[in-house]
Amino acid sequence: FKVATPYSLYVCPEGQNVTLTCRLLGPVDKGHDVTFYKTWYRSSRGEVQTCSERRPIRNLTFQDLHLHHGGHQAANTSHDLAQRHGLESASDHHGNFSITMRNLTLLDSGLYCCLVVEIRHHHSEHRVHGAMELQVQTGKDAPSNCVVYPSSSQESENITA
């Protein structure tokens, strides 16, 4: 399986909400002995590998933001802790999973990574990740809504997140 990032760049005005999205692609084994661990974290564009370093998102670690379930099941993070920080991660039945960040500030700008760990027979692991950049802007040059740039081409889409 692979992880796709529909958008590689999100440009948002301060105060807006945004939902960053990743999608699980390819054959997903829904067997009894296969589970998926999904999470989010901030990182940096490393010289060797992007998303290698795991930094917190608004003081919440990847441990706080994880989802753990089988196949294409729906799931949400524990609401209380994440929502106090204006965050929520979620997963649907179609392999999409996301993190929503509310009331963006300039400090939220940076590289965000989604991580999927496929666990087979409870201990054999396969890891994949996706990366996307969030730019939070302020002032007269800031867009009125979030503008997202698809990963494949640089045509922008205006969205109200």
Epitope: Y37, S52, Q63, H66, H68, V117, E125, R127
Partner: antibody
């Protein structure tokens, strides 16, 4: 405070039994895979047993298979290791440690000493 | 199971010197390797994850590199509190295994 605290170690004769406990606090215990890892005096680290976050499945090192039983009670935030038919070579400090998929042992207890001697 | 071999077994150095520790795997572990520090009477502490990333709160004098079968932990300038035993551990294959440790002692 995020911590793991082991208890239940002590001196026991060969063939005897002990039950170790590990109390977790400050984090969502039911999210984590848990391990018992031991360290014989002056030696390195050796994993003993593993239990998934839900309590199943369970794995044991060959050296303890059939003699040790790992279990957990997520409602009590506790991990256990029942050790039977103890041998001199089981003498070690026993640590509990937490783990997540694609991650490492980022939290350990301070350990409890098990001495098997006649 | 994957065997991790650490060298040297003991490293005798003075404070301020550079320490270079090695960990070699019997087969590739990709970048799924961690380093731990253990001081006498204490539990191990995670220093480095995924071969080269410092865990939370670990000083910048600790750095690490490598992938596949050969890995290195470097302490750029030894502080008194760095004298300890260092272990590598892999999670690419089951079971999770540790190296036998390298003791960094005061010369």
């Amino acid at each position: 405070q995020v911590q793991l605290v082991e208890s239940g170690g002590g001196l026991v004769k060969p063939g005897g039994s002990l039950r170790l406990s590990c109390a977790a606090s400050g984090f969502t215990f039911s999210d984590y895979y848990m391990y018992w890892i031991r360290q014989a005096p002056g030696k390195g680290l050796e994993w003993v047993s593993y239990i998934s976050n839900s309590g199943s499945p369970i794995y044991y090192a060959d050296s303890v298979k059939g003699r040790f039983t790992i279990s957990r009670d997520n409602a009590k935030n506790s991990l256990y290791l029942q050790m039977n038919s103890l041998r001199a070579e089981d003498t070690a400090v026993y640590y509990c440690a937490r783990d997540l998929p694609g991650w490492y042992f980022d939290l350990w207890g301070r350990g409890t000493l098990v001495t098997v001697s006649s | 199971e994957i065997v991790l071999t650490q060298s040297p077994a003991t490293l005798s150095l003075s404070p301020g010197e550079r320490a270079t520790l090695s960990c070699r795997a019997s087969q590739s572990v990709s970048s799924y390797l961690a380093w731990y520090q253990q001081k006498p009477g204490q539990a191990p502490r995670l220093l480095i994850y995924d071969a080269s990333n410092r865990a939370t709160g670990i000083p910048a004098r600790f750095s690490a590199s490598g992938s596949g079968t050969d890995f290195t932990l470097t302490i750029s300038s030894l502080e008194p509190e760095d004298f300890a035993v260092y272990y590598c551990q892999q999670r690419n294959n089951w079971p999770r295994t540790f190296g036998q440790g390298t003791k960094v002692e005061i010369k």
